[in-house]
Interface confidence: low
């Protein structure tokens, strides 16, 4: 939207004659008709597509035209348009003689035309006036013209509407080309988005006014860049909200289970090596010469049970001595004088002769060991259960009792709750140490994304007869996808009963 302005400055018709050559009596009472139209390489007759305007009588024969000239005429003449300025135009200015006061075309004699000028060309929008002078054999017209945009219209073609505002819908002023210039503290296509506190996390924080940083659920801190861990998380941190990722040495849902007793309590004495063996449990590997759960006891040399086959140990100044039972000899009573005839195998072991009966070997039943099957096997000593599983001896077998979330003979397998695809409507499943959590797509919520959140136009359930509702563009539109047998914008008509239209 804009205005073509034409400023008539001076008209000269010294001889006071009409275009036909006839003289005006007593002089040519001159008024102007202006026709503005689209660009024509050749300006030809036809509608004034961009507008037309007439002046009152401005003078007789030769005269200057002042600004806002008397007689009710406006100078400059205004030709408003409400379309995109094309940048080109054709202009026809006709000077007419008015013998009387009635200036309507039908009231004038057919030869009342004094002169007619036609120009065309390109004309960019701008404040600058273009000065032109057109002469004919009998007349001369000096005038200037320009195109300016209406209030709130901008750009080369006055096609960009821009109205400065500072309210809920935007906070901006307008640039000369019609683009928006946001007020300080605002951004976005229409400057409707506040610029949050510098550094405020893009996803985790937001603001409703400039320089603010309001944290979304699960986030905290001045810049909303610190996640809030699971409520009750003791020795853990998070990288996303409600997580509880345990610090080293801690376990359990709330990271309150001590898995690194060694580091936290240093229970092993006398330079022993500590190994964590489960929650609040540990094993000390003693240095030579020490014993006890925590290696707190100094060993006598007999403490290592060096005497075999039931030999008894005696401490001596320079070491120890083994007192062997009947049938055994050697430094550690390791040699036997027994044969199978002496029934040396305990606990149901079977005796096998060796060296033509001069010696023997015992084959032990399950759960027993030793050269005479004298020792019971503890199958749990090797800590066979992974992931904090508890080892139990069950007759000849050992069994691992697994912690929640683990399975397998050795508790080596993690049970994935996500394997069952528990999240509905395309939700993404995340395994936790105990259980799972679903991240839901837009429009769904609930532990398993099973709850549909109504959105926009479809929220009111406009579609009938089991039709599916789709939100359209803009979001306050909807489209109903009708099931077989129904028609209508809301699937309200059965096919067998067509709607009655009013035409």
């Amino acid at each position: 939207s804009g205005v073509f302005q034409l400023q008539l400055q001076e008209f000269a018709n010294e001889r006071g004659v009409l275009a036909s050559g006839r003289r005006c009596e007593p002089g040519c009472r001159t008024f102007f008709r202006v026709c503005l139209k689209h660009f024509q390489a050749v300006v030809s007759p036809g509608p004034c597509t961009f507008g037309s305007v007439s002046t009152p009588v401005l003078g007789t024969n030769s005269f200057a035209v002042g600004d806002d000239s008397s007689g009710g005429g406006r100078n400059p003449l205004q030709l408003p348009f409400n379309f995109t300025w094309p940048g080109t135009f054709s202009l026809i200015i006709e000077a007419w003689h008015a013998p009387g006061d009635d200036l309507r075309p039908e009231a004038l004699p057919p030869d009342a035309l004094i002169s007619k000028i036609a120009i065309q060309g390109s004309l960019p929008v701008g404040q600058k006036w273009l000065l032109d002078e057109q002469t004919s054999p009998l007349t001369r017209l000096r005038y200037s013209y320009r195109v300016i945009c209406s209030d709130n219209y901008y750009g080369d073609s006055c096609s960009r509407l821009c109205k400065k505002r500072n309210d809920h819908f935007g906070h901006y002023v307008c640039q000369p080309d019609g683009s928006l210039s946001c007020l300080p503290g605002w951004t976005g296509e229409y400057c409707e988005q506040p610029v949050c506190l510098s550094g405020c996390h893009e996803q985790n924080g937001y603001c409703s006014k400039p320089a603010e940083c309001i944290c979304r659920p699960g986030w905290q801190g001045r810049l909303c860049n610190e996640c809030i861990p699971h409520n009750g998380c003791r020795h853990g941190t998070c990288s996303t909200p409600w997580q509880c990722t345990c610090d080293e040495g801690w376990g359990g849902l709330f990271c309150d289970q001590d898995l690194n007793y060694c580091t936290h309590h240093s229970p092993c004495k006398n330079g022993a090596t500590c190994s964590n063996s489960g929650q609040r449990s540990y094993t000390c590997t003693c240095r030579p010469g020490y014993t006890g759960v925590d290696c707190e006891l100094e060993l006598s040399e007999c403490d290592s049970n060096p005497c075999r086959n039931g030999g008894s140990c005696k401490d001596q100044e320079d070491g120890y001595r083994c007192l062997c039972p009947p049938g055994y000899y050697g430094l550690h009573c390791e040699h036997s004088t027994l044969t199978c005839a002496d029934s040396p195998c305990f606990n149901g072991g079977s005796c096998q002769e060796r060296n033509q009966g001069a010696s023997y070997a015992c084959e032990c039943p399950p759960n027993f060991t030793g050269s005479n099957c004298e020792k019971k096997v503890d199958r749990c000593t090797s800590n066979p259960c992974a992931n904090g599983g508890q080892c139990l001896n069950r007759g000849p077998n050992r069994v691992c009792r697994c912690r929640p979330g683990f399975t397998g003979a050795h508790c080596e397998l993690h049970i994935s709750d996500c394997a069952r695809s528990p999240c509905a409507h395309g939700g993404t499943c995340h395994d936790l140490e105990t259980g799972f959590v679903c991240t839901c797509p837009a429009g769904f919520s609930g532990r398993r994304c099973e709850v549909r959140i109504p959105t926009e136009a479809c929220a009111s359930g406009p579609c009938l007869n089991g039709a599916t509702c789709y939100t359209g563009l803009p979001p306050d539109n909807f489209v109903c996808n009708c099931p077989y047998g129904f028609v209508g914008s809301r699937c309200e008509f059965p096919v067998s009963m067509p709607p009655s239209f009013p035409w």
């Epitope: 689209h38 390489a41 050749v42 030809s44 597509t49 094309p86 080109t88």
Partner: antibody
Framework: QVQLKESGPGLVQPSQTLSLTCTVS????????VSWVRQPPGKGLEWMGG???????DYNSALKSRLSLSRDTSKSQVFLKMNSLQTEDTAIYFC????????WGHGVLVTVSS | DIQLTQSPASLSASLDEIVTITCQAS??????LAWYQQKTGKSPQLLIY???SLAGGVPSRFSGSRSGTQYSLKISKLQVEDTGIYYC?????????FGSGTKLEI
């Protein structure tokens, strides 16, 4: 400056439909009309039809039953569709700015042959 | 439909001569007649519009005139580059019509 450019197939089978596009730049086709003119090899100019600024159309009486003109003002394009082509429709097809016909495209040669 | 009868169909003239081509309209078409020159392999070029007005960039040796429903194109002081085919066109009432053309050789 004002420019017109015709585009379309150079060869069309007899009885098939011809589709041509005239792309106009430098001027708005929602204000100015565009006409199609053709010229068989070695012959004179024939006005085929025009589509005016307001979207209305006029056609050459002899071609009216086969010819259809349309436009897409957003793309500044005018379209010609003519069906049931015969060998005598072989010609250079021009688009031109209606009015004084003061701007013309370079033309596109369409040959109707099997 | 309005008919335009153009004559002659062809003519040959020498350098610096004057030639006139005419177009007779079957109805009154006012000044809504234009003249075009077409050279081999080129698009037509506007010479005269509104029956008598010279188009921009056209040499002043070309001129147009009207007498009732007869329209004339006059070329004075013929030049080599004036070789071509000349057409008249009425755009007073659709369907618009061209004259049959006049082939000018220098």
């Amino acid at each position: 400056q004002v420019q017109l450019k015709e585009s379309g197939p150079g060869l069309v089978q007899p009885s098939q439909t011809l589709s041509l596009t005239c792309t106009v730049s430098g001027i708005s086709i929602s204000i100015y009309g565009v006409s199609w003119v053709r010229q068989p090899p070695g012959k004179g100019l024939e006005w085929m039809g025009g589509i005016w600024g307001d979207g209305s159309t006029d056609y050459n009486s002899a071609l009216k039953s086969r010819l259809s003109l349309s436009r897409d003002t957003s793309k500044s394009q005018v379209f010609l569709k003519m069906n049931s082509l015969q060998t005598e429709d072989t010609a250079i097809y021009f688009c031109t700015l209606s009015g004084d016909f003061d701007y013309w495209g370079h033309g596109v040669l369409v040959t109707v042959s099997s | 439909d309005i008919q335009l009868t153009q004559s002659p169909a062809s003519l040959s003239a020498s350098l610096d001569e004057i030639v006139t081509i005419t177009c007779q309209a079957s109805l009154d078409i006012g000044n809504w007649l234009a003249w075009y020159q077409q050279k081999t392999g080129k698009s037509p070029q506007l010479l005269i519009y509104g029956a008598t007005s010279l188009a921009g960039g056209v040499p002043s040796r070309f001129s147009g005139s009207r007498s009732g429903t007869q329209y004339s194109l006059k070329i004075s002081k013929l030049q080599v580059e004036d070789t071509g085919i000349y057409y008249c066109l009425q755009h007073y009432r659709a369907p618009f019509t061209f004259g049959s053309g006049t082939k000018l050789e220098i």
